[in-house]
C-alpha cells in the first residue's frame, strides 16, 4: 500500500522537516492516489484482458466519466487558474459515485480500493480551501448518483470489470491533468 | 524496447522555418500520463528544455521562445513533430526527443541527437 | 517562471572521493527534480528521479536528496566512468535545466 502523504516514499526523510504547504500536501496527496490507482489497475490487469481490450467503446457509453478539455481552463493555452480548479473539484465530486463502485470490486487489494476512496474525499477538502469561488461547484445529485451505483451494480460480469478499469483509468487522467494544472497555480 | 529517433535537416538558412520529426517505438501517445519532449544543446553548452507535448493534446512551451514552437503529435505514425520559426545563428545545436512517462515526470529515453546548423 | 541554480560548475576529483552537486530552484519545487548524466557526443542519461529515486539499472553509487528549495546529487565513491557533465532538472511547471556541472578525475 501507498505510505499515507505526510511520509511520501518519494521523500527522504529529513530531520526538522518544515510543515508542508498548502500546494505541497495536494501535490502529494494526488501522488499518493496515483499510487493507489497503479496497485489496483495491476489487479485488474492481471485479472481480466480488460487493460488490452478493444472493447472499451462498448462500456463507455454507459458511463460519464469526468474529463479535461481545453475549455476547462487546465492546460497550458488558455489556462485559467479559477475556471480550473472549480473544473477539478467538481470533477472529483462526479469522480465519488464512481470509487464508490469500485469498493467490493477487488479481492486483494480491497484496503487499496478504500485509501483512494478516502484520499480523494480529503484531496477535495484541500481542493475546496484553495478554491474562492465555491458557489460555481455543483455537487452531483444524491438520487442520480444512488440510481447509476445501481445501474453499474446489475451489468453483467465482463461490463463490470471492463467499467473497473474504465474508472481506474480514466480517474487516473484526471488527475495526472489536474497535477500538471495544479503546479501551474 | 523504446526507441526514440529524431529526423530534419542538418543545415537551416537563418530566418526559416525549421521543422523536426521524432519517431518513436515501444510506447504510445494515447496511454494516459505519456509525453514526448525536445531539448536542444547548443555546442559547448548547457541542455535547454524547448517543449513537450502529452498524451491528451496539452502541450508546453519554453516562456522564452514560445512565440516561435509548435509541437504537434500524430499517433498513428508514433511521430512529434516540432515546428521552430525565424530561426537564426543562436538557434545553432543538437536537438533530442525525450519521453516521459507518468506522474513522475522524468525523461527516461532519449533519441541520439540530431545535429542542426543555421548558417547561410 | 522558476530557476534552477546548479552548483559548482566544474569539479575536480579523486577515483574514490565522494562528489556532491547542489541544485537550488528560486521556489519550492516539492522533490519534483531529476538528475542526468551526459558524456561528451552522448544524449543524456537519466539517473534520478522525484529527488531520491534511483532509474532502472542506474549503479547505486548515484544518489539523490532534498526538499522544498535545496537538492544534493552524491556520487558515494567516484568511478572513471562517471566522467561526464551532470544537470539537474525541474517538473514545477515549465521544466528548466540547471547550468551543468562537469565533473573531472584529478
Known amino acids: 500500500a501507498p505510505v499515507p502523504p505526510g511520509e511520501d516514499s518519494k521523500d527522504v526523510a529529513a530531520p526538522h522537516r518544515q510543515p508542508l504547504t498548502s500546494s505541497e500536501r495536494i501535490d502529494k496527496q494526488i501522488r499518493y492516489i496515483l499510487d493507489g490507482i497503479s496497485a489496483l489497475r495491476k489487479e485488474t490487469c492481471n485479472k481480466s484482458n480488460m487493460c488490452e481490450s478493444s472493447k472499451e467503446a462498448l462500456a463507455e457509453n454507459n458511463l460519464n466519466l469526468p474529463k479535461m478539455a481545453e475549455k476547462d481552463g487546465c492546460f497550458q493555452s488558455g489556462f485559467n487558474e479559477e475556471t480550473c480548479l472549480v473544473k477539478i473539484i467538481t470533477g472529483l465530486l462526479e469522480f465519488e459515485v464512481y470509487l464508490e463502485y469500485l469498493q467490493n470490486r477487488f479481492e486483494s487489494s480491497e484496503e487499496q480500493a478504500r485509501a483512494v476512496q478516502m484520499s480523494t474525499k480529503v484531496l477535495i477538502q484541500f481542493l475546496q480551501k484553495k478554491a474562492k469561488n465555491l458557489d460555481a461547484i455543483t455537487t452531483p445529485d444524491p438520487t442520480t448518483n444512488a440510481s447509476l451505483l445501481t445501474k453499474l451494480q446489475a451489468q453483467n460480469q465482463w461490463l463490470q470489470d471492463m467499467t473497473t478499469h474504465l474508472i481506474l483509468r480514466s480517474f487516473k487522467e484526471f488527475l495526472q491533468s489536474s497535477l500538471r494544472a495544479l503546479r501551474q497555480m | 524496447q523504446v526507441t526514440l529517433r529524431e529526423s530534419g535537416p542538418a543545415l537551416v538558412r537563418p530566418t526559416q522555418t525549421l521543422t523536426l520529426t521524432c519517431t518513436f517505438s515501444?510506447?504510445?501517445?494515447?496511454?494516459?500520463?505519456?509525453?514526448v519532449g525536445w531539448i536542444r544543446q547548443p555546442p559547448g553548452e548547457a541542455l535547454e528544455w524547448l517543449a513537450h507535448i502529452w498524451w491528451n493534446d496539452d502541450k508546453y512551451y519554453n516562456p522564452a521562445l514560445k512565440g516561435r514552437l509548435a509541437v504537434s503529435k500524430d499517433t498513428s505514425k508514433n511521430q512529434v513533430v516540432l515546428s521552430m520559426n525565424t530561426v537564426g545563428p543562436g538557434d545553432t545545436a543538437t536537438y533530442y526527443c525525450a519521453r516521459m512517462e507518468d506522474y513522475d515526470e522524468a525523461m527516461d529515453y532519449w533519441g541520439q541527437g540530431i545535429l542542426v546548423t543555421v548558417s547561410s | 517562471d522558476i530557476q534552477m541554480t546548479q552548483s559548482p560548475s566544474s569539479l575536480s576529483a579523486s577515483v574514490g572521493d565522494r562528489v556532491t552537486i547542489t541544485c537550488r530552484a528560486s521556489?519550492?519545487?516539492?522533490?519534483?527534480l531529476a538528475w542526468y548524466q551526459q558524456k561528451p557526443g552522448k544524449a543524456p542519461k537519466l539517473l534520478i528521479y522525484?529527488?531520491?529515486y534511483l532509474a532502472d539499472g542506474v549503479p547505486s553509487r548515484f544518489s539523490g536528496s532534498g526538499s522544498g528549495t535545496d537538492y544534493t546529487f552524491t556520487i558515494s565513491s567516484l568511478q572513471p566512468e562517471d566522467i561526464a557533465t551532470y544537470y539537474c532538472q525541474h517538473f514545477w511547471g515549465t521544466p528548466p535545466f540547471g547550468q551543468g556541472t562537469k565533473v573531472e578525475i584529478k
Open positions: 522525484a529527488a531520491t
Open positions: 515501444g510506447f504510445s501517445l494515447n496511454t494516459s500520463g505519456m509525453t
Open positions: 521556489e519550492n519545487i516539492y522533490s519534483n
